[in-house]
Every structure is written in C-alpha cells, then in structure tokens.
Amino acid sequence: MAVTACQGLGFVVSLIGIAGIIAATCMDQWSTQDLYNNPVTAVFNYQGLWRSCVRESSGFTECRGYFTLLGLPAMLQAVRALMIVGIVLGAIGLLVSIFALKCIRIGSMEDSAKANMTLTSGIMFIVSGLCAIAGVSVFANMLVTNFWMSTANMYTGMGGMVQTVQTRYTFGAALFVGWVAGGLTLIGGVMMCIACRGLAPEETNYKAVSYHASGHSVAYKPGGFKASTGFGSNTKNKKIYDGGARTEDEVQSYPSKHDYV
C-alpha cells in the first residue's frame, strides 16, 4: 500500500514538475527590467528564451522573436538545450511511469518489470529535474554577471551631456517557476526510485524440501508454497510465497497474448 502511494505520489509530483518545466520554458519572463533606478517607467522590458517583449504603460505589449540561431549567445542556446532535454526526458519518464504504476494493470506484467520501469522513470525524472535546475541556474548566473557589468558602465557619457543607459535585467518569474518545477521533478524521481525498491522482488529463493516416497517423485509443498516438480531453485527468481493468498496475476503464470504490449 505504502509502495503504491509512494509511486503514485512520485508520479503526480513529477507530472506537476514537468508541467512547470514546460511552462517555464515557454514563459517570456526569464529576465525582467530592473526598476530600481526608475520605478515608474513608461516602458517595461522582459525577455524569454524565445522572444523579448516590451509592455508600455498603456498596457500595449509587443513581442519580437529571436529569429536568428547563430547570432544568439552560446549560453542562451545551452539553456534552451537543457530545458528541451529536461522536457523530453520528463515526457518519456511520464510515459514509462504510467505503465509502471502499480494501480494500472497491463496484462500480466510482472512486478519485476514494473520495478524496472519505475526505476527507469525515476532516473529520467531526476535527470530531467537536474537539467531544468541547471538551465535556470545558468541563465540566472548569466543575468547576475550582466547585471553587474551593466551597473559598472551604467552611464557612458556622450559629450558629458547625453546619457545612454543600458537596460539592466533582473530575475523573472520563469526562473522561480523553473527552479520549483525542477525541484519537484527531482523529488518525484527520487520517490519513484524509492517505490522501485518496494516493488522489486526479494532475492530470497524458497527451495522446496522433497521427500522420496516409493513410486513417483513428488515435491512436498508446505502450505502457502506453490507446488513445484523437481529440486531446482526458482529460476525466474520470483517470490513464490504469498501467505496463502493468490492474486489474479499469479494464477495466470504462463505468457498470454496480453503480456506483450
């Protein structure tokens, strides 16, 4: 029960996280104009990974896409790449984890397969979260560097009369969305990995004790153990002790057409 809850919660947390990563990647407010020197500006600038926008005090907003690929800073390209990798890995992780959920039955998929899928999706979520956090952090670092550089040469006098003021940018809402979303995806991934341990079959192999009676060889099975012919260990490494209770999955022990999706 706890395993199912942990897995389900991990899935939900990761889902929210990945939705947040997608939202952050699409948002225009990665960096916003610093209003420290002029809190009542007639024009407010903000920039995203894909376009830059300006909102006039009238409410009129105009955005322009970065229609160049080669002309963009390498750091911005790197941030884009990290965010996209994070989204792709997260999306694949979500797809895998749906099939791995203990509460969803697909044919007679064994617990070992579900455990492997849970672990795979968990790792994918962790990497996805790390990609998002890394992407946002790289962008934040870039902003901090540029902020202090533009502060250093804030006013470059032209003939002592004219001021050309560089627009300084500070952290936008998307950065915080990205950090939180990346963190959630990471936490979700860790939860999936923890759930995987609970789902994974125990390594204990139960060997039947056999008694040789006159006539044909029969393996003696104490209550709760499945009957097995011969002496060999359970080669499928399947936990065959179930305390007397049997699930529907255990009854159907041979592959069926539903096993291969």
Partner: antibody, heavy 119, light 112 residues
Framework: QVQLVESGGGVVQPGRSLRLSCAAS????????VHWVRQAPGKGLEWVAV???????NYNSALKSRFTISRDNSKNTLYLQMNSLRAEDTAVYYC?????????????WGQGTLVTVSS | DIVMTQSPLSLPVTPGEPASISCRSS???????????LYWYLQKPGQSPQLLIY???NPASGVPDRFSGSGSGTDFTLKISRVEAEDVGVYYC?????????FGAGTKLEIK
C-alpha cells in the same frame, strides 16, 4: 466620431480649487488611457497626469501633491481636481486620448479649457 | 526628467521647399527592444496638438507622406519634403520612454 470636450475652466484666486471635466464620446474610457496636458500662454506643452483603462494612474511628480485625476465610467468623463492653485498653473488644459492596443501615444486631443489663476 | 531640446525655434520656409526640424534628448530613447520612444506633434494656430509621427519614424493615420521622421537614440529629425501653407504651426517633439513624458520647446514653422 471621436471627441474630447473639456470644461470647468475659468478665473480662480490663488490657493483656491477647481475641478476640470473632460467628456469623451466616440470611445469608452474603459478601453483607453486619457492624459491631461497643459500649455501656459505662449509656452510649450507640459504633461500633468494620466489615468489608464484599468484605473492605474501616473502623475507628474512636480504636481502630484496638488492635482488628482479621476474618472466616472458611467458618464464616460474624466476629471482633474486642482487644489492650492498658483499663478504658474495658469494654462490651457487639454485632455488627450491614448490607445491601449497600439503603439501610438496621445492620438486625439480636446480643444482645451483655459484656467487663469489671478487675484 | 529627460530634457528635450529643439532647434531652430523659428523656421521660415518657402512653399514647395523642404524643411527640417531637429530634436535632441538628454538620454537615449532607444529601448532594448529596438523601438525609439520619440513622437512628433503639430499644433496649428488656434488648435490643439495633433499626432504626426509615433516611435520616431511611423506616420500616424491621415498624415501626408511628405512628413517623415528619422534619427538615432538621441538625435532626431522631422523632415517635410515640400512645405505647404497648411503645414504652418508649432512642431513639438516628445519622449515617452520615461515618466514624466516631456516635450521640446517647439519649433514655429512660418511661410516666407
């Protein structure tokens, strides 16, 4: 037909108050920003204040303490309350429309109302 | 506040001749998004101002194509290719990058 008609101007003594009105027709104040701009006799233009379609307000900091901009959406009318008037406030006061959906600034102006501050 | 300086203060022109009015701002009006927040207004005698050019170079609707605006971040020019009698009045430049919006002192265009 877009029209802005200012009223309420006249001769007023220093230290007294006056309220100017700007009746808008042909458009709704809830969709446009409206500015007050003044022009002293024989002088240039000076921006006073603006009220935006969403109710946000900006003032010229030099006049903020004495002037208050407001509007009545039901009457589609803009107001400028002027307190503690001084001789230097003598000017023609214009109201001007500012679209919220385009890059234009003040695109339509009223004919103005003259305020004379004199003892 | 951003200071707008216009020159000349008076400009006598012969009809049919070109005219040029200059405006300089104390701070660059070129925003990081590429827009320049400089506007030109004409106030004809006894009338209220009318918008001629917005964002430095874009003519407002109904403005004859003989009017054009150009400039850099701090130096701007309003050109009239062929002056007509109806163009007389005072021309103002205005910045709307920062509050308060500020106007130039005006250039009075007269017919010779």
């Amino acid at each position: 037909q877009v029209q802005l008609v200012e009223s309420g101007g006249g001769v007023v003594q220093p230290g007294r108050s006056l309220r100017l009105s700007c009746a808008a027709s042909g458009f709704s104040l809830t969709n446009y920003g409206v500015h007050w701009v003044r022009q002293a006799p024989g002088k240039g233009l000076e921006w006073v204040a603006v009220i935006w379609s969403d109710g946000r307000i900006n003032y010229n900091s030099a006049l903020k303490s004495r002037f208050t901009i407001s509007r009545d959406n039901s009457k589609n009318t803009l107001y400028l309350q002027m307190n503690s008037l001084r001789a230097e406030d003598t000017a023609v006061y214009y109201c001007a429309r500012h679209p919220a959906f385009g890059p234009h600034a003040m695109d339509y102006w009223g004919q103005g109302t003259l305020v004379t501050v004199s003892s | 506040d951003i200071v707008m300086t216009q020159s000349p203060l008076s400009l006598p022109v012969t009809p049919g001749e070109p005219a040029s009015i200059s405006c300089r701002s104390s701070k660059s009006l070129l925003n990081s998004n590429g827009n320049t927040y400089l506007y030109w207004y004409l106030q004809k005698p006894g009338q209220s101002p009318q918008l001629l050019i917005y964002r430095m170079s874009n003519p407002a609707s109904g403005v004859p194509d003989r009017f054009s605006g150009s400039g850099s971040g701090t130096d701007f020019t309003l050109k009239i290719s062929r002056v007509e009698a109806e163009d007389v009045g005072v021309y103002y430049c205005m910045q709307y990058l920062e509050y308060p919006p500020t106007f130039g002192a005006g250039t009075k265009l007269e017919i010779k």
